[in-house]
């Protein structure tokens, strides 16, 4: 028997957040915050002995949750 169609959302795509579009989802504290409380990290200088800089879709710093801790800047998707 054939399977039904796959979900339209890719397996690795971020799930919709409970935030209204005016806010962003802080993955660390797992709730919505003003987007200005999330901070995009500055890439490390070239040649620095560290992993590649994180992209905007990967965990990044959150001023609201304490600098250096993980957060995802997911604008509200309602």
């Amino acid at each position: 028997m054939r399977r039904g169609p796959r979900s339209l959302r890719g397996r690795d795509a971020p799930a919709p957040t409970p935030c209204v579009p005016a806010e962003c989802f802080d993955l660390l504290v797992r709730h919505c915050v003003a987007c200005g409380l999330l901070r995009t990290p500055r890439p490390k200088p070239a040649g620095a002995s560290s992993p590649a800089p994180r992209t905007a879709l990967q965990p990044q710093e959150s001023v609201g949750a304490g600098a250096g801790e993980a957060a995802l800047p997911l604008p509200g998707l309602l």
């Epitope: 409970p18 005016a22 987007c35 800047p73």
Partner: antibody, heavy 118, light 113 residues
């Protein structure tokens, strides 16, 4: 038709408490956060705070000017939002608006007037 | 707190004229995660409650006439009315929702010459 209707305003004395209500209809209230904003006569708008939706556990944010004195809450049906104001001061005299909050402050009520005077 | 500064505070115009008003924020309202500016414009007519005109600095709210245009990025924003109508006479407020507390400008009052 979208409707936000505030009520509960009036004349009170300094130090008194007052509770304002905002009844919402005509849109999916559960999708929205709800704000309270005030406007003293002839002056600019001031944001007081908001309450998030059910999906966010009705969490709140407040302006420093009212934090600890004012409390925003929602009823179980989510269609009514309250602003509980304690220890009122003369400078709290204003028209109080409730607004929905999604892309910005999308819908506004007509406002209810609060006068704090002895 | 982010301070929103609007200029001019009042503006005398004739019907049919093009009008621009300015809003400046004390810090950038551009969120690099989505390249959106967290700025809105509202119109408040005498004796009425405010009405949302523009959000994300340049997105017109549904039902708002296309003579209203929002532009700008970062800290400098402009609301333009391409051809003023008598019904546009009002106070216009900008507001940031980039961070708490949400803050409004003092408004620009549009009056008839």
């Amino acid at each position: 038709e979208v409707k936000l209707v505030e009520s509960g305003g009036g004349l009170v004395q300094p130090g008194d408490s007052l509770s304002l209500s905002c009844a919402a209809s005509g849109f999916t209230v559960t999708d929205y956060y709800m704000n309270w904003v005030r406007q003293p006569p002839g002056k600019a708008l001031e944001w007081l705070g908001f309450i998030r939706n059910k999906a966010n556990g009705y969490t709140t944010e407040y302006s420093a000017s009212v934090k600890g004195r004012f409390t925003i809450s929602r009823d179980i049906s989510q269609t009514i939002v309250y602003l509980q104001m304690n220890a009122l001061r003369a400078e709290d005299s204003a028209t109080y608006f409730c607004t929905s909050y999604k892309n910005a402050m999308d819908y506004w009520g007509q406002g209810t007037s609060v006068t704090v005077s002895s | 707190d982010i301070v929103m500064s609007q200029s001019p505070s009042s503006l005398a115009v004739s019907v049919g004229e093009k009008v621009t008003m300015s809003c400046k924020s004390s810090q950038s309202l551009l969120y690099s995660g989505n390249q959106k500016n967290y700025l809105a414009w509202y119109q408040q007519k005498p004796g009425q409650s405010p009405k949302l005109l523009i959000y994300w600095a340049s997105t017109r709210e549904s039902g708002v006439p296309d003579r209203f245009t929002g532009s700008g990025s970062g800290t400098d924003f402009t609301l333009t009315i391409s051809s003023v109508k008598a019904e546009d006479l009002a106070v216009y407020y900008c507001q940031q929702y980039y961070t708490y507390p949400l803050t409004f400008g003092a408004g620009t009052k549009l009056e008839l010459k």
